[in-house]
């Protein structure tokens, strides 16, 4: 299995359901399938009430059951902890995998719960982060905002995805914006090439 | 790299039994599901069913449920796919393909060259 | 259960672009579903040209490139070559994870 580096923005608008919810056990294999699924407890949907039309919420999410198929592995077995789970919508069920964004609630700091719930969103469709993974890179276009953490920390979790999202400034220029207090301060050099 | 080296070409008569092989080199063999895909002359490319060395869990597409058997030897790294009663519409070539995931996609990342199989009286 | 439809055949002059489609149903292709495309040159193993929607394997031109747009997916070869006349095959998994190939489509370089 191999996942592409994603900044948080990307897993949320990339998503068609982005929930807060507890994992309630171990997964049941499929038969006949490739797949395993796990019996979640959704808290919260964040994205996807468009996608999921009447549905209340969700009982499983599935995912493959081999790790080389990036099927995840959920390694907690604290059920009372609360996950925030981006994924994929396939005929009515969520899908995830090894490369999906996924992580406990408690872990993101309160402006990228922020973002989730409300900041991320102002972004999709209409801003673009674009991953730097080797120098020379550049801006393809005005849309996009230059995501030079792989470079600059060697990992995809770095200053950008933890404290900046990719958002518009005006109807035609995306630049980052800091999630901290106040959304309205820019990255200083947000458009330089690296 | 990943390698897939397959047996070499055969030519059987109908009714006779074989099994072709599939040597995989370069990677973990037990972790990778690999796959056989038969092309009849001419035609196009049709899944046959796949195989889990790790522990041989074994999937079959259902046009060639009861018509091949797919096993492997992990000691080996060796996948094989035979017949026990050839028939001469069975004449095809026959690829091995290692069924890998990338992010939602899952795919065949690398295959084997090939193994004619010709089935005449 | 999921099918792909290719056209049986392209064709196209060197220097041209030409896309090959690749069409399912909303159930499968209409979803999240990527499609991964393979090159068959005659006598010689398929290879792995596009995967994930838009990912070339290390080595593959980036004259290759795919698109997805509702139940329909795209290969696109741009500035055509003599060595690009192969069979393609694009390639999807069912709901259960099983791989699906589309019927393939014949590639002609003209001239």
């Known amino acids: 299995c191999s996942c592409a580096p994603t900044h948080p923005q990307t897993a949320f608008c990339n998503s068609d359901l982005v929930i807060r919810a507890k994992f309630m056990g171990s997964p049941e294999i499929i038969e006949t399938t490739l797949y395993q699924r796990y019996e979640i407890k959704m808290t919260k949907m964040l994205k996807g009430f468009d996608a999921v039309g009447n549905a209340t919420g969700f009982r499983f999410a599935y995912t493959p059951a081999m790790e080389s198929l990036c099927g995840y592995v959920h390694k907690s077995q604290n059920r009372s902890e609360e996950f925030l789970i981006a994924g994929r919508l396939r005929n009515g069920n969520l899908h995830i995998t090894a490369c999906s964004f996924l992580v406990p609630w408690h872990n993101l700091s309160p402006a990228q719960q922020k973002a989730f719930v409300k900041t991320y969103s102002a972004g999709c469709g209409v801003c673009t982060v674009f991953p730097c993974s080797a120098i020379p890179c550049k801006l393809e276009s005005d849309s996009h905002c230059l995501w030079t953490d792989q470079i600059l920390m060697g990992s995809e979790k770095g200053y950008q995805s933890d404290h900046f999202a990719c958002l518009p400034r005006n109807p035609d220029l995306c630049t980052w914006q800091y999630l901290g207090v106040s959304m309205t301060r820019s990255l200083p050099l947000a458009k330089a090439e690296a | 790299q990943v390698q897939l080296v397959q047996s070499g070409a055969e030519v059987k008569k109908p009714g006779e039994s074989l099994k072709i092989s599939c040597k995989g080199s370069?990677?973990?063999?037990?972790?990778?599901?690999i796959g056989w895909v038969r092309q009849m002359p001419g035609k196009g490319l049709e899944w046959m069913g796949i195989?889990?060395?790790?522990?041989?869990?074994?999937r079959y597409s259902p046009s060639f449920q009861g018509q091949v058997t797919i096993s492997a030897d992990k000691s080996i790294s060796t996948a094989y796919l035979q017949w026990s009663s050839l028939k001469a519409s069975d004449t095809a070539m026959y690829y091995c393909a290692r069924y890998y995931g990338f992010e939602y996609d899952l795919l065949f990342d690398n295959w084997g060259q090939g193994t004619l199989v010709t089935v005449s009286s | 259960d999921i099918a792909l439809t290719q056209p049986a055949s392209v064709s196209g002059s060197p220097g041209q672009s030409i896309t090959i489609s690749c069409t399912g149903t909303?159930?499968?292709?209409?979803?999240?579903?990527?499609v991964s495309w393979y090159q068959q040159h005659p006598g010689k193993a398929p290879k792995l040209m596009i995967y994930?929607?838009?990912n070339r394997p290390s080595g593959v031109s980036n004259r290759f490139s795919g698109s997805k747009s509702g139940n329909t997916a795209s290969l696109t070869i741009s500035g055509l070559q003599a060595e690009d006349e192969a069979d393609y095959y694009c390639?999807?998994?069912?709901?259960?994870?099983?791989?699906?190939f589309g019927g393939g489509t014949k590639l002609t370089v003209l001239g």
């Open positions: 994930a929607g838009n």
């Open positions: 390639q999807a998994y069912d709901s259960s994870g099983y791989p699906v």
């Open positions: 909303s159930s499968d292709l209409g979803g999240y579903n990527y």
């Open positions: 370069g990677y973990s063999f037990t972790s990778y599901w």
């Open positions: 195989i889990y060395p790790g522990d041989s869990d074994t």
